[in-house]
Interface confidence: low
Amino acid sequence: HNTTVFQGVAGQSLQVSCPYDSMAHWGRRKAWCRQLGEKGPCQRVVSTHNLWLLSFLRRWNGSTAITDDTLGGTLTITLRNLQPHDAGLYQCQSLHGSEADTLRKVLVEVLADPLDHRDAGDLWFPGESESFEDAHVEHSISRSLLEGEIPFPPTS
């Protein structure tokens, strides 16, 4: 899986979309998890409604929401009031039994609030994974990924 970069501004909301083949994943619940370490497990943050037919209903866990358009094949995650500690590597997953298939690997990056006049020297925060040769930016705010920059886990 290539990694897709989504960038958001601290304090604002960030919407992450994960497209998938609706037929291949028919009847499956979805989840959003955070990668713990470069090779660590993916810790569940939030999952869609227990009843697959109600997957369109938005479910929240803290400041993170998930909703699934099962016909169109798009899982949408909203990170509300984005904070630096939200930066890191995540996965959109399709669940079947005790197994989970990765739909998309997502790198969330948090940009400093341009109206925050504190030192804005280090705008980039935790967590790359996989090769970034093919990573692409899905948000209107973009940056070029440093050549050769290697996977690291979220830090705190």
């Epitope: 090779k39 660590g40 925060f125 935790p126 290697i150 886990p153 830090t155 705190s156």
Partner: antibody
Framework: QVQLQQSGPELVKPGASLKISCKAS????????MNWVKQRPGKGLEWIGR????????NYNGEFRVRATLTADTSSTTAYMQLSSLTSEDSAVYFC????????????????WGQGASVTVSS | DVVMTQTPLSLPVSLGDQASISCRSS???????????LHWYLQKPGQSPKLLIY???NRFSGVPDRFSGSGSGTDFTLKISRVEADDLGVYFC?????????FGGGTKLEIK
């Protein structure tokens, strides 16, 4: 305690292949990157690549990508480096070295090194 | 690739003196996660390299506090406050911010 025990010295002919082993003990082998580093006599250190034994994931230094193959056997906690089409330029000491990881903010430094495997390529 | 340049090549010191080794990288070593993956190793004759300092300024376990690392971005320094006979050898800086990992050419610390 962490130990990396490498195979012994080798004398090989030009054009031949060679497989060096690195037996790890004293830590969770599967979940730590293993690096391989080359040092020619009187020279500096050159990174060849790394392997994550847990899933076989590898990264290589471009110039070694064609001739070096990194593998790992989790059952015997041993990492291997195979070098093919050897030339005199490959005469060197080869080290295996574990990547130190201390979450959060993992260090990604090589904290434990094998004793080195000396390779001489000569006809 | 990131090129690491160490100076001086050779550093003659008297025991008890302070020694300072410089390491410069061709690109910034600040990773996008905010950390700087610059490390220092010591290789004594006939031995494997040993980790001294990781991530610019963190002493590895068992390393005396006479050793200290500093710097940021592209310029880094290793200082040995009071050189002892056991400190002699070749010092290498290394970066692991980007693949391929790269090493400096080494600085040989020797008795004056």
């Amino acid at each position: 305690q962490v130990q990396l025990q490498q195979s012994g010295p080798e004398l090989v002919k030009p054009g031949a292949s060679l497989k060096i082993s690195c037996k790890a003990s004293g830590y969770a082998f599967s979940s730590s990157w293993m690096n391989w580093v080359k040092q020619r006599p009187g020279k500096g250190l050159e990174w060849i690549g790394r392997i994550y034994p847990g899933d076989g994931d590898t990264n290589y230094n471009g110039e070694f990508r064609v001739r070096a193959t990194l593998t790992a056997d989790t059952s015997s906690t041993t990492a291997y480096m195979q070098l093919s089409s050897l030339t005199s330029e490959d005469s060197a000491v080869y080290f295996c070295a574990r990547l130190l990881r201390n979450q959060p903010g993992e260090s990604y430094a090589m904290d434990y090194w094998g004793q080195g495997a000396s390779v001489t390529v000569s006809s | 690739d990131v090129v690491m340049t160490q100076t001086p090549l050779s550093l003659p010191v008297s025991l008890g003196d302070q020694a300072s080794i410089s390491c410069r990288s061709s690109q910034s070593l600040v990773h996008s996660n905010g950390y700087t993956y610059l490390h220092w190793y010591l290789q004594k004759p006939g031995q494997s390299p040993k980790l001294l300092i990781y991530k610019v300024s963190n002493r590895f376990s068992g390393v005396p506090d006479r050793f200290s690392g500093s710097g940021s971005g592209t310029d880094f320094t290793l200082k040995i406050s009071r050189v002892e006979a056991d400190d002699l050898g070749v010092y290498f800086c290394s970066q692991s911010t980007r693949v391929p990992y790269t090493f400096g050419g080494g600085t040989k610390l020797e008795i004056k």
